[in-house]
Amino acid sequence: MKVLQEPTCVSDYISLSTCEWKMGGPTNCSAELRLVYQLVFLISETNMCVPENNGAAGCVCHLFMEDMVGADNYTLDLWAGQQLLWKGSFKPSEHVKPKAPENLTVYTNVSETLLLTWSNPYPPDNYLYEKLTYAVNIWNENDPTDSRIYDVTYQEPTLRIAASTLKSGVSYRARVRAWAQSYNSTWSEWSPSTKWYNAYKEPFEKH
């Protein structure tokens, strides 16, 4: 049994890290493998993750790591029974992938402006709470080429756009994702999308 692609891990920097790897051939991850993880600290528990399959040869493990701080460093040991397949380490603060924003809502009754709001997925006492900025993707449900990204470089989880910038009488969808520049994070997954009908009417022009 051989590891083809070594485990790579990302952390949501609140309670969970996710590690993925690939084996040399088809593997029943939960039956054959265990990922053992331990905080590098004088006395700390050695916790264990039962991996799940991610494709025929791919495995994924979710590691519980609450109360994360910047100095935290974990040792990782991948076992097949009593055989150690791979040994490595993981520092959550250096591999941050934020949680996806939540509760995306579109308000269409604000004069000629669309107001999009969402909630920061972190509690105020978390390090990432004030570090997140966002990207909002809006697209036409019937026309995949009619898609745009709005960068929200401020921390307020809102976006205002003129309804007139979108086609009238068309259903649109929006989704939002987050990243933390100061942590050199990757982008979060997209939030679930929300749908609305753009009923904006062009004002009648008099000649």
Epitope: S15, L16, S30, R34, V36, I43, E45, T46, N47, M48, C49, V50, E52, H62, L63, F64, M65, E66, D67, Q82
Partner: antibody, heavy 129, light 109 residues
């Protein structure tokens, strides 16, 4: 230094109730581990009672014999775990230990305790009339 | 899950090799730990994950086994090793933790 200190033990009459406390110091009681209770009757072996996950999800596990009469809970703000014991019987007489436990998890919803790494000194509960 | 530990007691001399066994009633993979307990004290973790030595535990202690059969070995018994030893099996199917009945190691003679 990490340590656990139990309190709340003492003499109680059959049918009575008692709440034991376990104060954690030197580590955060809300971090990724389980907090558990184990007991030992005089001159007898060790018997696991219950565990509660110390982090946000707070999932609990009980020995089959303890369900209904015993309840484990926590207060993360006080770094304390509790064991509420009701309808006590003479056979519940024992030293009650608090212990911190490692865990195994599968996915994000299935997580269970699997060994006790750090123990308190114990508190004696005597059930007698 | 039931954990059957044997022997329930044994007498040995300093320097002896001592073996204690624990049998689980179902497959518990490597979810087994070993503890040492002295009178009036809480148990002390010796071995976890069937064969991993806990922090600060002397290397004369070792554990082996997986599935249903497990062994704790003390390669050369020292005066401070006279105590009671317990195994602990964990079943992830039920989330339960069951201790063995214990093995009391006493001085021969």
């Amino acid at each position: 230094e990490s340590q656990l200190v139990e309190s709340g033990g003492g003499l109680v009459q059959p049918g009575g109730s008692l709440r034991l406390s376990c104060a954690a110091s030197g580590f955060s009681s809300s971090s990724a581990h389980y907090m558990c209770w184990v007991r030992q009757a005089p001159g007898k072996g060790l018997e696991w009672i219950a565990c509660i996950y110390a982090g946000s999800r707070g999932s609990t596990y009980y020995a089959s014999w303890a369900k209904g009469r015993f309840t484990i809970s926590k207060d993360n703000s006080k770094n304390t775990v509790y064991l509420q014991m009701n309808s006590l019987r003479a056979e519940d007489t024992a030293v009650y230990f608090c212990a911190r436990a490692a865990f195994v998890n599968r996915g994000v919803s299935w997580i269970w305790p699997y060994y006790f790494s750090l123990w308190g000194q114990g508190t004696l509960v005597t059930v007698s009339s | 899950i039931q954990m059957t530990q044997s022997p329930s007691s044994l007498s040995a001399s300093v320097g002896d090799r001592v073996t204690i066994t624990c049998q689980a009633s179902e497959d518990i993979e490597s979810y087994l730990a070993w503890y040492q307990q002295k009178p009036g004290k809480p148990p002390k973790l010796l071995i976890y994950r069937a064969s991993t030595l806990a922090y600060g535990v002397p290397s004369r202690f070792s554990g082996s086994g997986s599935g249903t059969d497990f062994t704790l070995t003390i390669s050369s018994l020292q005066p401070e090793d006279f105590a009671t030893y317990y195994c602990l099996g964990s079943s992830y199917s039920t989330g339960s933790n069951i201790f063995g009945t214990g093995t009391k190691v006493t001085v021969l003679g």
